[in-house]
């Protein structure tokens, strides 16, 4: 069977352009090293948003310039994406790979539709 990865269907970013969701995977074995990748799918185009490899029980480490942060707890990864704008609305897909020990397993979630609404500019005060 494919490794099952679950994530919420819909999330609304807050007024600061931040969206959070949980990516949960059903691990077939006792993985110690896990790689999580967030992919954005829009109009059949797929781009990588961010990725992190972590050791079970340790924090996720994204690149310094990444728009993602996250924490892990067991087979759950809590992901936060920052700096989103209306044009970033799309399907954000969680891809999980169990890197070590062998055998390798991989699963892909069905995606979280993230809606981003740009805030209205404040009216000028006289």
């Amino acid at each position: 069977k494919a490794m099952h990865v679950a994530q919420p269907a819909v999330v609304l970013a807050n007024s600061r352009g931040t969206a959070s969701f949980v990516c949960e995977y059903a691990s077939p074995g006792k993985a110690t090293e896990v790689r999580v990748t967030v992919l954005r799918q829009a109009d059949s185009q797929v781009t990588e948003v961010c990725a992190a490899t972590y050791m079970m029980g340790n924090e996720l480490t994204f690149l310094d310039d990444s728009i993602c942060t996250g924490t892990s707890s067991g087979n759950q990864v809590n992901l936060t994406i920052q700096g989103l704008r209306a044009m970033d609305t799309g399907l954000y897909i969680c891809k999980v790979e169990l890197m070590y020990p062998p055998p390798y397993y991989m699963g892909i979630g069905n995606g979280t539709q993230i809606y981003v609404i740009d805030p209205e500019p404040c009216p000028d005060s006289d």
Partner: nanobody, 126 residues
Framework: QVQLVESGGGLVQPGGSLRLSCAVS????????IGWFRQDPEKEREMVSC????????KYADSVKGRFTISRDNAKNTVYLQMNSLEPEDTAVYYC???????????????????WGQGTRVTVSS
Amino acid sequence: QVQLVESGGGLVQPGGSLRLSCAVSGFSSDYYDIGWFRQDPEKEREMVSCIRSSGGSTKYADSVKGRFTISRDNAKNTVYLQMNSLEPEDTAVYYCGLAPISPVHAVCNQHYFGYWGQGTRVTVSS
């Protein structure tokens, strides 16, 4: 444990034909993409052709359209790549890849592939 085993590579003269096979085991799902990719030492791995298990949607690289044909035999869990009118530029190691997707995922997108075979070498030379 998912395993993909390629066969059928070899040395062929320009204008000749080969048929590659990819046998899949250890994976059971109604939905997946299986693709053929190739790589030579100077280049990144590129998708040559791909087929979706359900519905049979196919995708081809522009460089092989009209020359290569992908097909599948679900009963044998095997995917084939018929390569005709081979050119020296087709020389590479050919890999079979599997993407454990669902209907929401874009057809045959390289980001969704995670399981790979060991590769079979194709050499086109006179």
